[in-house]
């Protein structure tokens, strides 16, 4: 079972594993997302674009994501289930200007079954 | 014998190796598609159209490929024997716009024969 | 503060080659696309090609047709540029760029490359 | 490729004149709600530097003199008080896609 205190949309349940949503404004180009649990940066994505608005994305935590025009979701596939753990996104805008760094809203997900097998349950 | 968790479509086998299939929607024209094995990247496959609409096709893994205008097949002669492994393939939409990244669904494979020779055996 | 100092040009035949560098200080080189723009002589400015904050995707200006390379050494916080093949058209005043997310926001003081026999 | 051109080519002003240059791109650098088109000065046996991004944006530490505007395809970059130190050529670029292009340019005289 999975306990939510942040916007139910934030967690998910996908596949034995749990997809954390971030949203960010989509009127942002270009930005670095971090997923932190706790103290702890479990994924990080920048978009970037080129002279040419050509777009790279790095991803060098090697995470499973999706990216869409307002926001990054991370698939986590063994979350941690020995206690219960807050969840938030940190966001950085490089683009538009001026240059922003935001927390946002967060979640407290706590895992009771020992594999994420069969239903996701939410108190809000 | 090989387990596959995601999709049977996924794995099929093909003349001593396995045929990895990668989906992706028909409206898509221009796209990158990677093939990871766990964090690896074993293929990459990348579809432009230049100015007068002439198709460029990178394979610069030069993993044995076929591409259709839904999927891209990547064959893999030798698969990793030794442990199971997650398979996953990662796409990069380019056209039409927005610009999109997104994993889509794996799959575990796992070769029980010393050699792939004779069925494809999945579990889903 | 920002710098980028370029250096490598100087005088090649046609058909030789030439490597230009450029060393990048005051900003955290890795996080940022850079670019190489030219200036032929009493000539206006034109883009010769990019390349991404980790070294992985380059893109070129179509005259260049193969002939350069771009890449990078983030370690070193050093842009390359490789010019092959060069001909007397590619005599100019090359400038390392830092793609400040939204323009060249940082130019070299540029190196002079002449291609004469 | 997209095409830009500038006009004029050159300008010969006095010091506090209005100045305007046009720039033109072949197709709209308008995606979102931002204009991809920025503009540089370059003095004599200088580096270019930065004046205006996205159009209308001062970069940092541009004095206000210098107003960009336009939309789509038109654009212009004008000196509301021209003063001596603003002599040099003007470029527009945009970076809507690639190849980034550049403006032929406008070199501004003193009169």
């Known amino acids: 079972e999975i306990n939510g205190s942040a916007d139910h949309r934030m967690f998910s349940f996908h596949n034995g594993g749990v997809q954390i949503s971030c949203k960010y404004p989509e009127t942002v180009q270009q930005l670095k997302m971090r997923l932190f649990r706790e103290r702890e940066v479990l994924c990080e994505l920048t978009k970037t674009k080129g002279s040419g608005n050509a777009v790279s994305i790095k991803n060098p935590m090697l995470c499973l994501y999706h990216l869409s025009n307002n926001s990054v979701s991370f698939f986590l596939n063994n979350p941690d289930s020995s206690q219960g753990s807050y969840y938030f996104c940190s966001l950085s805008i490089f683009d538009p200007p001026p240059f922003q760094e935001r927390n946002l809203s967060g979640g407290y997900l706590h895992i009771y079954e020992s594999q994420l097998c069969c239903q996701l349950k939410l108190w809000l | 014998e090989i387990n596959g968790s995601a999709d049977h479509r996924m794995f099929s086998f093909h003349n001593g190796g396995v045929q990895i299939s990668c989906k992706y929607p028909e409206t898509v024209q221009q796209l990158k598609m990677r093939l990871f094995r766990e964090r690896e990247v074993l293929c990459e496959l990348t579809k432009t159209k230049g100015s007068g609409n002439a198709v460029s096709i990178k394979n610069p893994m030069l993993c044995l490929y076929h591409l259709s205008n839904n999927s891209v097949s990547f064959f893999l002669n030798n698969p990793d024997s030794s442990q199971g492994s997650y398979y996953f393939c990662s796409l990069s939409i380019f056209d039409p716009p927005p610009f999109q990244e997104r994993n889509l669904s794996g799959g575990y494979l796992h070769i029980y024969e010393s050699q792939l020779c004779c069925q494809l055996k999945l579990w889903l | 503060e920002v710098q980028l100092v370029e250096s490598g040009g100087g005088l090649v035949k046609p058909g030789g080659s030439l490597t230009l560098s450029c060393a990048a200080s005051?900003?955290?080189?890795?996080?940022?696309?850079m670019d190489w723009v030219r200036q032929g002589p009493g000539k206006g400015l034109e883009w010769v090609g990019n390349i991404d904050e980790d070294g992985s995707t380059t893109y070129y200006a179509p005259f260049v047709k193969g002939r350069f390379t771009i890449s990078r050494d983030n370690a070193k916080k050093t842009l390359y540029l490789q010019m092959n093949s060069v001909k007397s058209e590619d005599t100019a005043t090359y400038y390392c760029t830092r793609w400040g997310r939204y323009a060249f926001d940082s130019w070299g003081q540029g190196t002079l490359v002449t291609v004469s026999s | 490729d997209i095409v830009m051109t500038q006009s004029p080519s050159s300008l010969a002003v006095s010091p506090g004149d209005k100045v305007t240059i046009n720039c033109k791109s072949s197709?709209?650098?308008?995606?979102?709600?931002?204009?991809?088109l920025a503009w540089y000065q370059q003095k004599t046996g200088q580096a270019p530097k930065l004046l205006i991004f996205?159009?209308?944006t001062r970069h940092t530490g541009v004095p206000d003199r210098f107003m960009g505007s336009g939309s789509g395809t038109d654009f212009s970059l004008t000196i509301n008080s021209f003063q001596t130190e603003d002599l040099g050529d003007y470029y527009c670029q945009h970076h809507y896609s690639t190849p980034p292009t550049f403006g032929p340019g406008t070199k501004l005289e003193i009169k």
């Open positions: 996205y159009a209308s």
């Open positions: 005051g900003f955290t080189f890795s996080d940022y696309w």
């Open positions: 197709q709209s650098l308008l995606s979102g709600n931002y204009n991809y």
